[in-house]
């Protein structure tokens, strides 16, 4: 496929530009002028003027938008001003505000809890498989395999701390070298960014909101992928991470510290442990080739156990395997030795829903996966709604200015670095980059935070999660201290290196541009978001994993042509945008390719055909369900559930039903109302936030 989703015939002009897949779009082409456009590559087309960096890419039939879709919506207040209210109104408004705050915190609490349960669900569904990925012996020699294993395992267990702790235990048991562990850590960094991308999918109902939320979430993905793309080859060639961290670990005489403070877990654990409790040691045991662990359940049944140490007689293949020469004897046939065994006596069962069901892990995982996604989705919708009603007028202005405004000249450059520190600090507090970035996603979606500001916050979050790991490493027992600290430092320096690559110079902030590009594509073709998720987090890693297992020759044989084609496309794209005259006329645009290779429109038709069966029914279900269906059926007025089916029928008759973007309305409430999301009366009773 060509670099951008829709590629038309265009002549570059450095002075005027149109948005192709990313960037600003102050002007829009007249739709009427493009009526003669067909799928035939030879057909005459209107010349569209573009900024060189956007090459010959234009979005076919892009709905005309008056404003730049990346501009934050103006969250104006439609309610009665505070000064115009009587005492009763003021009291009512105050309690309304308190109520909203309590609701917001409540939904935020369940949002974080559902993320925790989601992680547990993923571990139940794919934890054992994840453990088995680690027991692959090729990791030692193949960094690419290590990388994809890191991605797959973290995606499967939805927790980078789980995958890194497995790596740490494998390194301390000499099953893995630090060198082999580094690519896995890089992969874990990528895998952890799937969580907020899933959260962004929940905002699919509103195109404009989804555009921002999805871009805001994927900026994390692109940062991690690009960092790995550059730093993995550098690490393989120079081993700089291994060397630096080894020097640090050897130069300090660390004493075992205390555990990293569990600040957020203290609040969420009482609730989540009532839902399910997992024995995470099982995954580590599988990773370390413990055959018995493969038959163990991840669902914790006994929470209170009594451990009694006893000595038992065991047979050994030879006297060399004896515990000690004096603890070695024979019965004439077999050699025996005495082994210390820990006998575990179960005392009290755990207090969680699944303790007495004795369901297989897959069943429990599936149930929790569905429930946690529903709760996650529901909480997200409610958070967005409450924030939408609170963040209006003066409050919105203050918050948006505080978050998105830079320091005065000449210190403007420092703002981003402060945001990195804030992101790191917040992540350290909540002890999870997934939680922090997932909480950030809806704020980007509703337009409180710009992607430009979310980017350093996300980078900070990456640093924050590594400082947590460093603290956890310092609390490790003696034998694991060195390896866990070195791995935590590798993680830390990898993220620092990534920031140095993709942040200081504005020109190098590729992840923002790429995320915006993906945001635009996904806003137009919402199914592409799911496609992206499956491709980048499952298919590509699984393909590389499969090819790696087949051997280096196969990996190189398939990989080299693929990489060559990608480089060729990128070079061609660069030439098309910078100096198209050096290219033959045919290569000055992508029209020489069949439409399916340069546009998502034919693919959209295929997806629409597949999802057509859902379209007539999808919007007649509950609102949460409806949002999920929207993602598939790309229903233009999806969240107006009662009237959705009629809209769909109209759409099928060939009438395009445009959705007015929220930024063109006075405020979010009105925009949602226009889309049938909230009753009209709601806006009248809105209370102006102080």
């Amino acid at each position: 496929m060509a670099p951008w989703p829709e590629l038309g015939d265009a002549q570059p002009n450095p002075d005027k530009y149109l948005e192709g897949a990313a960037g600003q779009q102050p002007t829009a082409p007249d739709k009427s002028k493009e009526t003669n456009k067909t799928d035939n590559t030879e057909a005459p087309v209107t010349k569209i003027e573009l900024l060189p960096s956007y090459s010959t890419a234009t979005l076919i039939d892009e709905p005309t938008e008056v404003d730049d879709p990346w501009n934050l919506p103006t969250l104006q207040d439609s309610g009665i001003k505070w000064s115009e209210r009587d005492t009763k109104g003021k009291i009512l408004c105050f309690f309304q505000g308190i109520g909203r705050l309590i609701l917001l915190l409540g939904f935020l609490y369940f949002f974080v809890c559902s993320l925790d349960i989601l992680s547990s669900a993923f571990q139940l569904v794919g934890g054992k498989m994840a453990g088995q990925f680690f027991s692959n012996s090729s990791i030692m020699s193949n960094p690419l395999l290590g990388l994809v294993i890191g991605v797959l395992v973290t995606v499967l267990v939805q927790s980078s701390s789980t995958s890194t702790s497995i790596v740490v235990s494998m390194v301390s048991s000499s099953l893995l070298t630090v060198r082999a562990a580094i690519p896995i850590i890089m992969g874990a960094n990528i895998g952890t960014s799937i969580t907020n991308t899933i959260v962004a999918l929940m905002q699919v109902g509103d195109r404009s909101e989804f555009r921002r939320a999805f871009a805001g979430a994927t900026v994390h993905d692109f940062f991690n992928w690009l960092s790995v793309l550059v730093l993995l080859p550098v690490e393989v060639a120079t081993h700089y991470l291994e060397i630096i961290t080894q020097l640090i670990v050897e130069s300090f005489h660390f004493k075992n510290g205390e555990d990293a403070p569990d600040l957020l877990k203290v609040i969420t654990k009482p609730f989540t442990k009532l839902i399910v409790q997992l024995d995470k040691k099982v995954i580590s045991q599988i990773a370390m080739n413990d055959e018995k662990a493969k038959n163990k359940s991840l669902v914790k049944i006994w929470c209170k156990t009594f451990t009694n140490k006893t000595q038992i007689n065991v047979t050994v293949p030879s006297t060399a395997n004896c515990t000690s020469p004096s603890l070695c004897w024979t019965d004439g046939i077999q050699n025996w030795t005495m082994k210390n065994v820990t006998y575990k006596e179960n005392i009290a069962k755990c207090q969680h829903i699944f303790v007495n069901f004795h369901l297989p892990d897959l069943a429990v995982g599936t149930i929790l996966l569905i429930l946690s996604l529903l709760v996650l989705c529901g909480c997200l919708i409610m958070i967005v709604k409450i924030l939408g009603s609170v963040l209006k007028g003066q409050v919105a202005t203050v918050i948006k200015k505080t978050i998105n405004t830079d320091f005065p000249f000449p210190f403007a450059w420092l703002t981003g670095y402060l945001a990195i520190l804030v992101g790191a600090g917040m992540t350290f507090i909540v002890q999870s980059s997934s939680v922090f970035t997932s909480a950030l996603t809806p704020l980007i979606g509703i337009g409180v935070i710009t992607i430009e500001r979310a980017y350093p916050l996300t980078l900070g979050s990456n640093i924050g999660t590594t400082t947590t790991a460093i603290l956890a490493a310092l609390a490790s027992p003696g034998n694991a201290l060195r390896s866990s600290l070195q791995i935590a430092l590798c993680h830390f320096f990898f993220n620092i290196s990534g920031i140095l690559l993709w942040y200081p110079i504005p020109f190098t902030r590729l992840p923002i541009r790429m995320a915006k590009g993906l945001g635009n594509i996904s806003a137009k073709y919402r199914w592409f978001a799911v496609f992206y998720l499956i491709i980048f987090f499952f298919l590509i890693p699984l393909t590389v994993f499969g090819l790696s297992l087949a051997g280096w020759r196969v990996l190189v044989g398939v990989g080299v042509p693929v990489v060559f084609i990608i480089i060729l496309v990128l070079c061609l794209r660069l030439l098309q945008s910078r100096c198209p005259r050096v290219l033959p006329k045919k290569l000055q645009n992508w029209n020489f390719l069949p439409l399916w290779m340069r546009s998502l429109k034919p693919w959209d038709a295929v997806v629409s055909k597949f999802t057509g069966c859902f379209q007539m029914r999808c919007c007649c279900c509950c609102r949460v369900c409806c949002r999920a269906c929207c993602l598939l059926c790309d229903c233009p007025k999806c969240c107006r559930c009662s009237k959705c089916c009629e809209d769909l029928e109209e759409a099928q008759e060939g009438q395009d039903v445009p959705v007015k973007a929220p930024e063109t309305f006075d405020n979010i409430t009105i925009s949602r109302e226009a889309q049938g999301e909230v009753p009209a009366s709601d806006s009248k009773t809105e209370c102006t936030a102080l």
Epitope: S326, C328, W329, T330, D331, G332, I333, Q334
Partner: antibody, heavy 120, light 107 residues
């Protein structure tokens, strides 16, 4: 009670083979290791080897390896020892014995012994 | 193979005397040592295993001690029926090996 009854005395020529039996009763034959020990006239005890009747696993003293074969017939609860290439120094009383003290090589029940005389 | 060296090869003591027989292993055998009593014309009889554990039916006057390479069998009060040859045996390594025996007689 546990009983180990061995076959009668044998007089054999040098270079020949001898196969003696040890019929057991009073316990589950396949449970315990069966040891074979010999005692030359006026000499000490010498361990020949052992067999676990349950699986047929055997273990031999290197000194006798290649000359001795231990077998067990579960159907008749009988253990056999065959010693080949006999020499005059093989003249001894051969005992079958079992160890009911699980996991140890301390033998607590003995057969009455089979006297093998190697003489031309 | 592990050599078990017994001493003395024979001893003569009076009834009621305390008799000590020693056994030295050529290498560490832990506590995997057994003691046997063989009366003239009879089959050997297990007295002690695991260095100091008396077998069922063995009188309390028989006791064993030691570990590693040095082991002892003690008859606290010699009785006429104790006249026999006593053998030590190691079962630490295959092949199982016996000591040369100690012949105990009554004065």
């Amino acid at each position: 009670q546990v009983q180990l009854v061995q076959s009668g005395a044998e007089v054999v020529k040098p270079g020949a083979s001898v196969k003696m039996s040890c019929k057991t009763s009073g316990y589950t034959f396949i449970t315990y290791n069966m040891h074979w020990v010999r005692q030359a006239p006026g000499q000490g005890l010498e361990w020949i080897g052992a067999i676990y009747p349950g699986s047929g696993d055997t273990s031999y003293n290197q000194k006798f390896k290649g000359r001795v074969t231990l077998t067990a017939d579960k159907s008749t609860s009988t253990a056999y020892m065959e010693l080949s290439s006999l020499r005059s120094e093989d003249t001894a009383v051969y005992y079958c014995s079992i160890s009911t003290i699980i996991t140890t090589g301390a033998v607590d029940y003995w057969g009455q012994g089979t006297l093998v005389t190697v003489s031309s | 193979d592990i050599q078990m060296t017994q001493s003395p090869s024979s001893l003569s003591a009076s009834v009621g005397d305390r008799v000590t027989i020693t056994c030295k292993a050529s290498q560490d055998v832990g506590t995997a040592v057994a003691w046997y009593q063989q009366k003239p014309g009879k089959v050997p009889k297990l007295l002690i295993y695991w260095t100091s554990t008396r077998h069922t039916g063995v009188p309390s006057r028989f006791s064993g001690s030691g570990s590693g390479t040095d082991f002892t069998l003690t008859i606290s009060s010699l009785q006429p029926e104790d006249v026999a040859t006593y053998y030590c045996q190691q079962y630490s390594r295959i092949p199982l090996t016996f000591g040369g025996g100690t012949k105990v007689e009554i004065k």
